[in-house]
């Protein structure tokens, strides 16, 4: 998994990387495999009814550094992990949803500093 503080631009790969894809496959993908010049990813997020949905696929090199950083988004529970070490490496990624915070399901008082 890429570290949150990592800020170096991703280095171009010399060769294509194949990833497993699920809910995120290009139209022409064969056997649920996609190809990329960047990263494989697996992501877990809550759908509108609060159920966890796992998505996996390919991220292009362009912009993937930001996408793989897994910056927390307010009021959205999701987690993403990225890898490049071998083909279909994202089969072995198992991101977990961040824990619920009280304010996610109770509208408590608003505190101002």
């Amino acid at each position: 998994k890429k570290e949150d503080g990592e800020s170096t631009a991703p280095t171009p790969r010399p060769k294509v990387l194949r990833c497993k894809c699920h809910h995120h496959c290009p139209e022409d993908s064969v056997n649920n495999i996609c190809s990329t010049d960047g990263y494989c990813f697996t992501m877990i997020e809550e759908d509108d009814s609060g159920l966890p949905v796992v998505t996996s696929g390919c991220l292009g090199l362009e912009g993937s550094d930001f996408q793989c950083r897994d910056t927390p988004i307010p009021h959205q529970r999701r987690s993403i992990e990225c890898c490049t070490e071998r083909n279909e490496c994202n089969k072995d990624l198992h991101p977990t949803l961040p824990p619920l915070k009280n304010r996610d399901f109770v509208d408590g008082p608003i505190h101002h500093r």
Epitope: K15, V16, D28, S35, D37, E62, R86, N87, E88
Partner: antibody, heavy 116, light 112 residues
């Protein structure tokens, strides 16, 4: 410089199997895929499949599944393609080729003749 | 499979002339990464193909600047500005966007 060495010619009987070799030099073998391509006169070029020597991951053209099996020996930087149940339709020139996002270097090709 | 249609099949030229070869694909070659993996090769008699142009318009190392590639989506062109004797042979376009990778049927460049 990048070199992919293949035997010049092979002659085999129908029904036999054959393992073609491709010895790579001049680059880090595991840093690129190795592809195999078939060329028959008047039939153009056909992509058979590819193997990533870093993890032995293979992808095949559906048309050649069951006909071709790709392997590598990283200790000798050699790629292999086993062809089974050979018929006259398999008589062709077979190229190995280095692939990153496109083929940039080709072997000289092995001419396979299947004949009784 | 993506069908690559090359025209013309044969291209007779005089040395010093400009030559133009067309390659059309049956579907877009724009990859999900934004790259277009369309390439051009020259195969001389009795030899293996040599890479000329990769990703539509990038000349491979050592390829003279009289070779240029252009196009987008499904429509691509290889141009040779001034044909020299060493340019004669069969030109192939190839795509590595979609599996299985496919090739054009070839254009034979020959002397008029």
């Amino acid at each position: 410089q990048v070199q992919l060495q293949q035997p010049g010619a092979e002659v085999v009987r129908p029904g036999a199997s054959l393992k073609l070799s491709c010895k790579a030099s001049g680059y880090t073998f595991t840093s690129y895929w190795m592809q195999w391509i078939k060329q028959r006169p008047g039939q153009g070029l056909e992509w058979i499949g590819e193997i990533d020597p870093s993890d032995n991951y293979t992808m095949y053209n559906q048309k050649f599944k069951g006909k071709a099996t790709l392997t590598v020996d990283t200790s000798s930087s050699t790629a292999y393609m086993q062809l089974s149940s050979l018929t006259s339709e398999d008589s062709a020139v077979y190229f190995c080729a280095r692939f990153g996002f496109y083929v940039d270097y080709w072997g000289q090709g092995t001419t396979l003749t299947v004949s009784s | 499979d993506v069908v690559m249609t090359q025209t013309p099949l044969s291209l007779p030229v005089s040395l010093g002339d400009q030559a133009s070869i067309s390659c059309r694909s049956s579907q877009s070659l724009v990859h999900s990464t934004g790259n277009t993996y369309l390439h051009w090769y020259l195969q001389k008699p009795g030899q293996s193909p040599n890479l000329l142009i990769y990703k539509v318009s990038n000349r491979f190392s050592g390829v003279p600047d009289r070779f240029s590639g252009s196009g987008s989506g499904t429509d691509f062109t290889l141009k040779i500005s001034r044909v020299e004797a060493e340019d004669l042979g069969v030109y192939f376009c190839s795509q590595s966007t979609h599996v299985p990778f496919t090739f054009g049927s070839g254009t034979k460049l020959e002397i008029k």
